[in-house]
């Protein structure tokens, strides 16, 4: 068990001409709130996929009012971190959705508003109990910059958050066979109480002899990969029982990292992430010094001057991990903007821009008006050498070609369903309620339970609201 | 979180008139739909009035012509004007809040209006 923590650190123009217009306004003051939603692994999900590893809510941020005439700045921010609660192992890989929501405050007709501002989103790696990892991610023209980190809460330790701790039982030293539990060196790791031969890559347990596996891996010790299709014909008489081809064993099984690595398949083979002051193809090479010349790609070693004491290696730009023996993928990040091609070229990076757009991160769009019609009826309009649409009612998105859901904030209260209407929305509400968005129960105590509302209410009745 | 402090109640003749008032402690009252109810001895809490952050109004029935509900958000304040009073609108009179920030509903303490000759 454990929490992922992200922090938001600005949200604003990005850099390059075409700046977004502010949110919000001297008629429409607004606040920012953040929703995350994290998946595990790194599959490419749709937005609306549930959010498996869990998903958290900002407090709302202070009013915001535009100034006049000023360029729309870093916008005023919700205090504290987001917070997302895991109950299992953290997964290492994982996808996560950022979204940054816009709440009008307005007196404006249908009272407050939300509206999504932005959507970012990315598959990362990610190891429980690492330091903060930074990020900037683009949507359009807005740029949010934050950081995460994954921390397990004891006694779990460990890149996974399997390992568990206990205090120390003599004062001086752990146990045969058991390490100190960095970085609570007061505590012992506990000894393993998994089945035995449970996989350590791919099961964890958090009762003594059970093996539970991560997503992904399946069987009693969690070392047969879950097939991604569904078998049809069975091969030889070995699999009649199931009619499926029974995978071989994967590179990570019975895991070849030592010393506390963890496993990773690559295509040809297999990789082992190190615990610091361990490197080799296995981390089999231990006692390593800032003599040993353990940083890679021009890193910088400092401390380590004995084997007790562990370095570490300042990496230059464009590596990372432990040792620097990782090469940033810094089009992960996705710089290119309006749909530009990643290229990194080592030295560099390069955006191949999608026609009609140029510029070092194809931020230009070239086309501005011309040529480029809003959809459904929305008029464009032109500015700083990019277009925009104005959108008629009922349709939003860059070219109007997204129908804009008034239903999707939730608008009516107490279970009472919302219908969008081409003027607005109606709230059809439960026996019991009633007000134009079911705010108001007839009979507080048991307003669920009524079967109808007195003569003259309806609460059943859509109210609308517009 | 949200507090309800009503004032206005008292006693009143059959036909006269009472306005009743309720201060919100809340920074954003224009987030929240507001409403008054009342309970008479030995009856349920019932609706009497409510008007929505977007400044719909409902009634119930009994008191449609008599009663008026209104809000002004710069005074963080929502009253209900009663005339015509009559014996059966006797009750204590609640000051009913729902926020549509934390989506939940707050009441106030009550005041006591007694129409009686």
């Known amino acids: 068990a454990g929490v992922f923590e992200l922090q938001i650190h600005s949200f604003g123009p990005g850099p390059g001409p075409g700046a977004p217009r502010s949110p919000c306004s001297a008629r429409l003051p607004c606040r920012l709130f953040f929703r995350v939603c994290l998946k595990p692994g790194l599959s490419e999900e749709a937005a609306e996929s549930p959010c498996a590893l869990g998903a958290a809510l900002s407090a709302r941020g202070p009013v915001y009012t535009e100034q006049p005439g000023a360029p729309a700045p870093d916008l005023p921010l919700p205090d504290g971190l987001l917070q997302v609660p895991f109950r299992d192992a953290w997964p290492g890989t994982f996808s996560f959705i950022i979204e940054t929501w816009r709440e009008e405050l307005g007196d404006q007709i249908g009272g407050p508003a939300w509206s999504l501002l932005a959507r970012v989103a990315g598959r990362r790696r990610l190891a429980a109990g690492g330091p903060w990892a930074r990020d900037i991610q683009r949507a359009g023209a807005w740029e949010l910059r934050f950081s995460y980190r994954a921390r397990c809460e004891p006694p779990a330790v460990g890149t996974a958050c399997t390992r568990l701790c206990r205090p120390r039982s003599a004062p001086s030293r752990c146990g045969p066979g058991l390490r100190p539990c960095a970085p609570l060196e007061d505590e012992c790791e506990a000894p393993l109480v998994c089945r035995a031969g449970c996989s350590p890559e791919h099961g964890f347990c958090e009762q003594p002899g059970e093996c539970r596996c991560l997503e992904g891996w399946t069987g009693p010790l969690c070392t047969v990969p879950v097939s991604t299709s569904s078998c049809l014909s069975p091969r030889g008489p070995s699999s009649a029982t199931t009619g499926c081809l029974v995978p071989g064993p994967g590179p990570c099984d019975g895991n070849p990292c030592a010393n506390g690595g963890s496993c990773s398949e690559t295509p040809r083979s297999f990789e082992c992430t190190c615990p610091r002051g361990f490197y080799g193809l296995r981390c089999e090479v231990s006692g390593v010094t800032c003599a040993d010349g353990p940083c890679f790609n021009g890193g910088l070693c400092v401390g380590g001057a004995d084997p007790d004491s562990a370095y570490i290696c300042h990496c230059p730009p464009g590596f990372q991990g432990s040792n620097c023996e990782k090469r940033v993928d810094r089009c992960s990040l996705q710089p290119c903007r309006n749909g530009g091609l990643c290229l990194d070229l080592g030295h560099a990076l390069r955006c191949r821009c999608r026609a009609g757009f140029a510029g070092p991160r194809c931020e230009h769009d070239l086309d501005d008006c011309a040529g480029r019609a809003c959809a459904n009826g929305g008029t464009c309009v032109e500015g700083g050498g990019a277009h925009r649409c104005s959108c008629a009612l009922g349709f939003g998105g860059r070219d109007c070609r997204e129908r804009a859901d008034p239903c999707a904030a939730r608008p009516c209260a107490h279970g009472g369903r919302c219908y969008a209407h081409f003027s607005g929305l109606v709230c059809a509400c439960a026996p019991g309620y009633m007000g134009a968005r079911c705010e108001f129960p007839v009979h507080p105590d048991g307003a669920s339970a009524l079967p109808a509302a007195p003569p003259g209410l309806r609460p059943g009745d859509p109210q609308r609201y517009l | 979180e949200v507090q309800l402090v009503e004032s206005g109640g008292g006693l009143v003749q059959p036909g006269g008139s009472l306005t009743l008032s309720c201060a919100a402690s809340?920074?954003?009252?224009?987030?929240?739909?507001l409403a008054w109810y009342r309970q008479a001895p030995g009856k349920k809490r019932e609706l009497v009035a409510g008007?929505?952050?977007?400044?719909?109004?409902v009634y119930m029935d009994s008191v449609k012509g008599r009663f008026t509900i209104s809000r002004d958000n710069a005074k963080n304040s929502v009253y209900l004007q009663m005339n015509s009073l009559r014996a059966e609108d006797t009750a204590v009179y609640y000051c009913?809040?729902?926020?549509?920030?934390?989506?939940?509903?707050?009441w106030g303490q009550g005041t006591l209006v007694t129409v009686s000759s």
């Open positions: 008007i929505s952050d977007d400044g719909s109004i």
């Open positions: 009913y809040a729902y926020s549509w920030i934390t989506r939940s509903p707050y």
């Open positions: 809340s920074s954003s009252v224009s987030l929240l739909s």
